[in-house]
Interface confidence: low
């Protein structure tokens, strides 16, 4: 057993440009508080998965009112540590979520309003009993500085708080089979205190409160001999006396689930089904009630008036999870049509539509040419959310308002001279060339030289020249 301790040092604007606006104002004073959630292991768990190692809320910080015109400073913090007690071994590796919450203190209908300012998360390795580790995490434009440590509660010691120590009875040495408890050399390792009633002959424990059975024994206190029918059990080593398989200690032997939880084996370990009002890996965390304010993001807490009855959080739109702690990524459903950009504003979804589309979900295809006139006889062509004018000869530009010089591109080949004409352009070809653009040489016999046929076609076969 032990305690995880978190010390928040500062919460304020991070370095660099784009300093955040102060979360409080003269009109709307507020104060901060923090929530920490701990989970064992280094797995990337979903935000709404239970805080199996425990969770804690800080006290509320001092009321803060922004000074007009002043940049957002480091905000005043609650006093004291956030402490998360753990009953079992410290896992050594853990994941954390630290949330910074704002409590608005203006004239709110129905009491103060809470909103999540920032959430940081990480995965760390940490030995119990070690020094304070320090960390800096950034969430958007905010920066959170904090330190943390895990410490064992006496008589537990060690990097996992699984060894027990007690004062030495003699100054020179510990009892038989017991080592000194480094670094507390004046203390000795204490024998593990197994679950009350655990058979001293047939049971043992690796953690306080456990009762694991030796081969051939079962039951919560290892007092029940395994019947011969268990020879059919696939688990455990072969027994020399009976010649059949005897179950070895299983993960549910001795029922590791506290507070009346029921244990079921899983392929790798065990799983506790906890009674109402308890949660945690071994149902070790006592019940949370609505009085503890477990529902975040404006969730409504129902039930849970006493620790024995569970609470339910009814989440506002955009949030989910047992504590409304997870923001729903509603944009992942791609609600915006026709390539619109989805914006989840928390209280609502917004679609930013591409040109030519409109509507809450960009579902309306606008008539691109509606109200758009193409000048000088040009015709409007719709396409891709933008209008385009196909201009009459002699005109150009987006709306065909510019008079085009058809000869500007020097369209007449082989030295031909270009003349602008009301219907377009005319090429006066140099001697020896012919065609609308003077592109074909004239043979001495008077026949024009057509381009050579592509491979596989005979001259004279019908073909198009582009």
């Amino acid at each position: 057993a032990g305690v995880f301790e978190l010390q928040i040092h500062s919460f304020g604007p991070g370095p660099g440009p784009g300093a955040p606006r102060s979360p409080c104002s003269a009109r709307l004073p507020c104060r901060l508080f923090f929530r920490v959630c701990l989970k064992p292991g280094l797995s990337e768990e979903a935000a709404e998965s239970p805080c199996a190692l425990g969770a804690a809320l800080s006290a509320r910080g001092p009321v803060y009112t922004e000074q007009p015109g002043a940049p957002a400073p480091d905000l005043p913090l609650p006093d004291g540590l956030l402490q998360v007690p753990f009953r079992d071994a410290w896992p050594g590796t853990f994941s954390f979520i630290i949330e910074t919450w704002r409590e608005e203190l203006g004239d709110q209908i129905g009491g103060p309003a809470w909103s999540l300012l920032a959430r940081v998360a990480g995965r760390r390795r940490l030995a119990a009993g070690g020094p304070w580790a320090r960390d800096i995490q950034r969430a958007g434009a905010w920066e959170l500085r904090f330190s943390y440590r895990a410490r064992c509660e006496p008589p537990a010691v060690g990097t996992a708080c699984t060894r027990l120590c007690r004062p030495r009875s003699a100054p020179s040495r510990c009892g038989p089979g017991l080592r000194p408890c480094a670094p507390l050399e004046d203390e000795c390792e204490a024998p593990l205190v197994c679950r009350a009633g655990c058979s001293p002959e047939h049971g043992f424990c690796e953690q306080p409160g456990e009762c694991r059975c030796l081969e051939g024994w079962t039951g919560p206190l290892c007092t029940v001999p395994v019947s011969t029918s268990s020879c059919l059990s696939p688990r455990g080593p072969s027994s020399a006396t009976t010649g059949c398989l005897v179950p070895g200690p299983g993960p549910c032997d001795g029922n590791p689930c506290a507070n009346g939880g029921s244990c079921s084996e899983t392929p790798r370990s065990f799983e506790c089904t906890c009674p109402r009002g308890f949660y945690g890996l071994r149902c070790e965390v006592s019940g949370v009630t609505c009085a503890d304010g477990p529902c975040f993001n404006g969730g409504l807490c129902v039930g849970g008036a006493d620790p024995d009855s569970a609470y339910i959080c009814h989440c506002p739109p955009g949030f989910q999870g047992s504590n409304c702690e997870k923001r729903v990524d509603r944009c992942s459903l791609q609600p915006c049509r026709n390539g619109g950009l989805c914006l989840d504003l928390g209280h609502a979804l917004r679609c930013r539509c591409r040109a030519g589309f409109a509507g809450p979900r960009c579902e309306h295809d606008l008539d691109d040419c509606a109200g758009r006139a193409c000048a000088n006889g040009g015709t409007c062509v719709e396409g891709g959310g933008a209008h385009r004018c196909s201009c009459a000869l002699g005109f150009g530009g987006r709306d065909c308002r510019e008079r085009a010089d058809p000869c500007a591109a020097r369209p007449c080949a082989h030295g031909g001279r270009c003349y602008a004409h009301f219907s377009g352009l005319v090429c006066a070809c140099a001697p020896g060339y012919m065609g609308a653009r003077c592109e074909f040489p004239v043979h001495p016999d008077g026949a024009s030289a057509l381009p050579a046929a592509p491979p596989g076609l005979r001259p004279g076969d019908p073909q198009r020249y582009l």
Epitope: Q7, H9, S10, D74, L81, G130, P131, W132, R134, D135, I136, R145, S147
Partner: antibody, heavy 122, light 107 residues
Framework: QVQLVQSGAEVKKPGASVKVSCKAS????????ITWVRQAPGQGLEWMGD?????????NYNEKFKSRVTMTRDTSTSTVYMELSSLRSEDTAVYYC??????????????WGQGTLVTVSS | EIVLTQSPATLSLSPGERATLSCRAS??????LHWYQQKPGQAPRLLIY???QSISGIPARFSGSGSGTDFTLTISSLEPEDFAVYYC?????????FGGGTKLEIK
């Protein structure tokens, strides 16, 4: 500019205690760790521990000194204190306070006090 | 605890020469190593942090390298004011420890 100004030299008898002060200025006092390092005459540097002034309870001590050293702070005067008890002659040294840089989360010490000579002699 | 061994204990060189100071850790300290300079009667001064990261105000002739257990501080061309004692420090694990120092003296 950042400055760490330490208290003056002390002469103590074995078994007594000494309390060295380190007054910080030129930066936000509560946002930087202060560490204590000592240097015996003609010897190298030895880390004693550190304290986060934003929270007086947040300290790390070298196990070698853990039973004898206490680090505290007074935010009203931006001062950190290091008290060493049960003094012995081998505690004669110059005691430095230093500010730990926050660059990259390093524990490196970027600003140092001028040092306080503590002499333990009977 | 992690022991840092600096070598040589004393290095005699002339101004303009290149100085190479070594620091070896008893076990891997990743890149958690810093270098300090100390002159007689003065407090140490941070030169390099995290093996090779330079500190503003420190001349560019000071550079650091290495990883794991072997680290080097190099002074490319010695100036008269560079003659001092140099310490390495590890911040990989507790307690934080310093090397015994290398005294750089004028030849």
């Amino acid at each position: 500019q950042v400055q760490l100004v330490q208290s003056g030299a002390e002469v103590k008898k074995p078994g007594a205690s000494v309390k060295v002060s380190c007054k910080a200025s030129g930066y936000t006092f509560i946002s930087y760790w202060i560490t204590w390092v000592r240097q015996a005459p003609g010897q190298g540097l030895e880390w004693m521990g550190d304290i986060y002034p934003g929270s007086g309870s947040t300290t790390n001590y070298n196990e070698k000194f853990k039973s004898r050293v206490t680090m505290t702070r007074d935010t009203s005067t931006s001062t950190v204190y290091m008290e060493l008890s049960s003094l012995r002659s081998e505690d004669t040294a110059v005691y430095y306070c230093a500010r730990e840089t926050t660059v990259g989360g390093a524990y490196a010490m970027d600003y140092w006090g001028q040092g306080t000579l503590v002499t333990v002699s009977s | 605890e992690i022991v840092l061994t600096q070598s040589p204990a004393t290095l005699s060189l002339s101004p303009g020469e290149r100085a190479t100071l070594s620091c070896r850790a008893s076990q891997s300290i990743n890149n958690n190593l810093h270098w300090y300079q100390q002159k007689p009667g003065q407090a140490p001064r941070l030169l390099i942090y995290y093996v090779s990261q330079s500190i503003s105000g420190i001349p560019a002739r000071f550079s650091g390298s290495g990883s794991g257990t072997d680290f080097t501080l190099t002074i490319s061309s010695l100036e008269p004011e560079d003659f001092a004692v140099y310490y390495c420090q590890q911040t990989n694990s507790w307690p934080l420890t310093f090397g015994g120092g290398t005294k750089l003296e004028i030849k």
